[in-house]
Interface confidence: low
């Protein structure tokens, strides 16, 4: 029997995201989207989107339970995507559950996004 | 492994519709946005728009506004896209991508003649 | 919309050639360019994110650089896996928007 994982998102505000517009600011942090609630199993795949948009362009990075995330080769990885970033966790395992975060932030502004994994 | 299928090749008459499929595996549809990019006969790529199968949102290319439906069926892990009001210059193939176009589908050539 | 150009519009190489290929914006998109190589009746391959990222499974010998209006991809020992046609695609601003291609073929 499948052991389920799921990951539920702190809703935040957002607004859509509209670059066209937004890009005609001096400066700006979105946070577009909370992260999404997704299921998974043990074994399987797992992936966590920080949805943001900024100009400058933002700097994002991730946290589990407060922690820096550290990468794993071939397992734990995340890097930066045309929404913002992605952290990817493949063959999951019970310990890979706790809190995750993104906090974006463009030297002005700084927007974060909280899940969990559990 | 993640796989993007599509729908087969379509034959259209100038003044219809064609709706493509887009069936994903291996991973999660509904956290991924699916892009719709398009390629006529020797020519370039040209992006068509994405959809957000979470939520349903669209964004398109404003070249197509009107004529460009993304829909989605979350159940069989299946993306839409239907281009309505068909003429010669769609004549194309059409591709499916997820969110920062990792992974591509095969490609649905949709021919438009009369 | 953002206009994306690219030089050559096709050159020919050899076996173990370096190989650069240029795209320009027709406006400031930072760092949001994406470079692809497609092949005949194939679906295109992403090779570079963010405008210097090479992406996963992507051999080193090919790299990016760049910021603003002006990038480059280089093979820096042409294969003969790697003859196909190279695109860059800005996605600063919508619509996202594909350079014209630039096709490398043997010599």
């Known amino acids: 029997q499948e052991t389920e994982l799921s990951v539920s998102a702190e809703l935040v505000p957002t607004s859509s995201w509209n670059i066209s517009s937004e890009l005609n600011k001096d400066s700006y942090l979105t946070l577009d989207e909370p992260m999404n609630n997704i299921t998974t199993s043990l074994g399987q795949t797992a992936e966590l989107h920080c949805k943001v948009s900024g100009n400058p362009p933002p700097t994002i990075r991730w946290f589990k339970n407060d922690a820096p995330v550290v990468q794993e080769p071939r397992r734990l990885s995340f890097r930066s995507t045309i929404y913002g970033s992605r952290l990817r966790i493949r063959n999951l395992d019970t310990t890979d559950t706790g809190y995750f975060q993104c906090v974006a932030t463009n030297g002005k502004e700084v927007v974060s996004s909280t899940g969990v994994l559990f | 492994q993640v796989q993007l299928v599509q729908s087969g090749a379509e034959v259209k008459k100038p003044g219809a519709s064609v709706k493509v499929s887009c069936k994903a595996s291996?991973?999660?549809?509904?956290?991924?946005?699916m892009h719709w990019v398009r390629q006529a006969p020797g020519q370039g790529l040209e992006w068509m728009g994405w959809?957000?199968?979470?939520?349903?949102?669209?964004k398109f290319n404003h070249k197509f506004d009107g004529r460009v439906t993304m829909t989605r069926d979350t159940s069989t892990s299946t993306v839409y896209m239907e281009l309505s009001s068909l003429r010669s210059e769609d004549t194309a193939v059409y591709y499916c991508?997820?969110?920062?176009?990792?992974?591509w589908g095969q490609g649905t050539m949709v021919t438009v003649s009369s | 919309d953002i206009q994306m150009t690219q030089s050559p519009s096709s050159l020919s190489a050899s076996v173990g050639d370096r190989v650069t290929i240029t795209c320009q914006a027709s406006q400031d998109i930072g760092n949001n360019l994406i470079w692809f190589q497609q092949k005949p009746g194939k679906a295109p391959k992403s090779l570079i994110y963010?405008?210097?990222s090479l992406a996963n499974g992507v051999p080193s010998r090919f790299s990016g650089s760049g910021s603003g209006t002006d990038f480059t991809l280089t093979i820096s020992s042409l294969q003969p896996e790697d003859f196909a046609t190279y695109y860059c695609?800005?996605?600063?601003?919508?619509?996202?928007?594909f350079g014209p291609g630039t096709k490398v073929d043997i010599k």
């Open positions: 959809i957000y199968p979470g939520n349903g949102n669209t």
């Open positions: 963010f405008a210097t």
């Open positions: 291996g991973y999660t549809l509904t956290t991924n946005y």
């Open positions: 695609l800005q996605y600063r601003e919508y619509p996202l928007t």
């Open positions: 991508a997820i969110s920062d176009f990792d992974y």
